[in-house]
C-alpha cells in the first residue's frame, strides 16, 4: 500500500477524502483529519504535519487549511439557540427556539420567525423535525375540537356526556366542546362538559 | 510514552470530602480537553465531568453537579477533581481520560490506570 | 439526556466466530461515536471513533458501521485476546453517555 506523500502523474489521488492534490511538487499527500488543521505543508520527502484547532475553533471535514473555523454561538436575536457546543471538529448546532421555524436558510437556519397562530377548529399538522417549516393548519378531525388561536394547541377530543352520567345539551363541533346536562334538567345548563349540581 | 497518573484515591465518610489529581506526560497537556469518568464496581463506564483546554468549556454529569469540581494546571500538567459532600453512591474506581485530538470533548484516546474512591461509614 | 442502548448484555461465542453488537442512540448522533474494550482491572482502551476509524494499533478485525441512530460493532473472527467488555459511547452531547456493554466470552 502507497502511504502519501507519492507522486502522481494524472493529478488524482487514490483516497480523495483523506489525501489531495499538491501541483507544485504534483504529488499526493494527506489531508488533515476533522478538527486539526495544515501546520506544516507537505513535500516530495515529508508528509502535511497537521495541529489540533485551539480552543473555540473547528474543521469539520478532511481538510489541507492552514486555519481552523473560529466557533459562533447561536444567535437568540435571530430565534437561534444552542443544542451542542462547538468542538473541534463541528460548529455550535442551533436550531430554532421553541414557538419558532426556520424562515431563512443557507446552508443552516439563519434566521427563526415566529409559528403562526392556527385558528379555532384546527392544529397544526405535526411535522417531521422541530422547527423546519411554519405551521400548516389541518381541520380537526370528527370527534374532536380546538377553542383558542394558537400554534401549538392541539384537537381535544369531544367530552362524553354519559362517561359522566350526563346526557347532550348540545352536540360538539369543530370549534366547541360537547355540553352536557343533567338528566333531570329540563333545560341544557350554560356548561362545557361538567356537571352543574 | 504518553501518560495520565491518577492519585489521591482512597476511604472517606459520608459527606467527606477527596482531591483526585492526574499527572499527564508524553503529549502537550495544553492542548487536550481532559474527562473524568468513573466506574463503580461491577458497574459500566460513567462520565462525570469534561473540561476544555482553556478552561472555557466546563461541563458535570447531573448526579456530581453543584458537589465535584474540575480543574486544570497546563503549567503542572495536571488535571484535578474536588469531591464534596461525596455519598456512598460516588463509590467508585476514577479515571483520568484525554479527548482525542479536541479542545472540547470527544473519544476518549488515552486512559489512566484509575484510583478507587471508598465512600463508606 | 442521549440514551445509549446496547445489545446484548453478555455473548459467548467460539474462536473464529464473528461477533456483532449493536448500540442505539435515543437521537441521532451523526457519527460521534466511539467503543472502548475493557479486560478485568484494566482501564478501558479506545478502538474505534468517529462511528468507524479504527485507532492507530488496533487489529482490523475489529470493524464498525452505522451512523445517525444505529450502530453495530463487529469482531470477524473472535480471538482469545478478545475476551474482555465491551462499551459504546456518545460524544455528540453533554451529558457524554455509554451504553451499558456488551460482556464477551468464549464458549
Known amino acids: 500500500q502507497v502511504v502519501p506523500p507519492y507522486g502522481s502523474e494524472n493529478q488524482t489521488c487514490r483516497d480523495q477524502e483523506k489525501e489531495y492534490y499538491e501541483p507544485r511538487h504534483r504529488i499526493c499527500c494527506s489531508r488533515c483529519p476533522p478538527g486539526t488543521y495544515v501546520s506544516a505543508k507537505c513535500s516530495r520527502s515529508r508528509d502535511t504535519v497537521c495541529a489540533t484547532c485551539a480552543e473555540n475553533s473547528y474543521n469539520e471535514h478532511w481538510n489541507y487549511l492552514t486555519i481552523c473555523q473560529l466557533c459562533r454561538p447561536c444567535d437568540p436575536v435571530m430565534g437561534l439557540e444552542e443544542i451542542a457546543p462547538c468542538t473541534s471538529k463541528r460548529k455550535t448546532q442551533c436550531r430554532c427556539q421553541p414557538g419558532m421555524f426556520c424562515a431563512a436558510w443557507a446552508l443552516e437556519c439563519t434566521h427563526c420567525e415566529l409559528l403562526s397562530d392556527c385558528p379555532p377548529g384546527t392544529e397544526a399538522e405535526l411535522k417531521d423535525e422541530v422547527g423546519k417549516g411554519n405551521n400548516h393548519c389541518v381541520p380537526c378531525k370528527a370527534g374532536h375540537f380546538q377553542n383558542t388561536s394558537s400554534p401549538s394547541a392541539r384537537c381535544q377530543p369531544h367530552t362524553r356526556c354519559e362517561d359522566q352520567g350526563l346526557v347532550e345539551a348540545a352536540p360538539g363541533t369543530a370549534q366547541s366542546d360537547t355540553t352536557c346536562r343533567n338528566p333531570s334538567e329540563s333545560l341544557p345548563p350554560e356548561m362545557s362538559g361538567t356537571m352543574l349540581m | 510514552e504518553v501518560q495520565l497518573v491518577e492519585s489521591g484515591g482512597g476511604l472517606v465518610k459520608p459527606g467527606g470530602s477527596l482531591r483526585l489529581s492526574c499527572a499527564a506526560s508524553g503529549f502537550t497537556f495544553s492542548s487536550y480537553c481532559m474527562n473524568w469518568v468513573r466506574q463503580a464496581p461491577g458497574k459500566g463506564l460513567e462520565w462525570v465531568s469534561s473540561i476544555s483546554t482553556g478552561n472555557t468549556y466546563i461541563y458535570y454529569s447531573d448526579s456530581v453537579k453543584g458537589r465535584f469540581t474540575i480543574s486544570r494546571d497546563n503549567a503542572k500538567n495536571s488535571l484535578y477533581l474536588q469531591m464534596n459532600s461525596l455519598r456512598a453512591e460516588d463509590t467508585a474506581v476514577y479515571y483520568c481520560a484525554r479527548a482525542r485530538y479536541n479542545w472540547n470533548y470527544d473519544a476518549f484516546d488515552i486512559w489512566g490506570q484509575g484510583t478507587m474512591v471508598t465512600v463508606s461509614s | 439526556d442521549i440514551q445509549m442502548t446496547q445489545s446484548p448484555s453478555s455473548l459467548s461465542a467460539s474462536i473464529g466466530d464473528r461477533v456483532t453488537i449493536t448500540c442505539q442512540a435515543s437521537?441521532?448522533?451523526?457519527?460521534?461515536l466511539s467503543w472502548y474494550q475493557q479486560k478485568p482491572g484494566k482501564a478501558p482502551n479506545l478502538l474505534i471513533f468517529?462511528?468507524?476509524n479504527l485507532e492507530t494499533g488496533v487489529p482490523s478485525r475489529f470493524s464498525e458501521s452505522g451512523s445517525g441512530t444505529d450502530f453495530s460493532f463487529t469482531i470477524t473472527s473472535l480471538q482469545p485476546e478478545d475476551i474482555a467488555t465491551y462499551y459504546c459511547?456518545?460524544?455528540?452531547?453533554?451529558?457524554?453517555?455509554f451504553g451499558g456493554g456488551t460482556k464477551v466470552e468464549i464458549k
Open positions: 437521537q441521532d448522533i451523526s457519527n460521534f
Open positions: 468517529d462511528a468507524s
Open positions: 459511547q456518545q460524544y455528540y452531547n453533554v451529558p457524554l453517555t
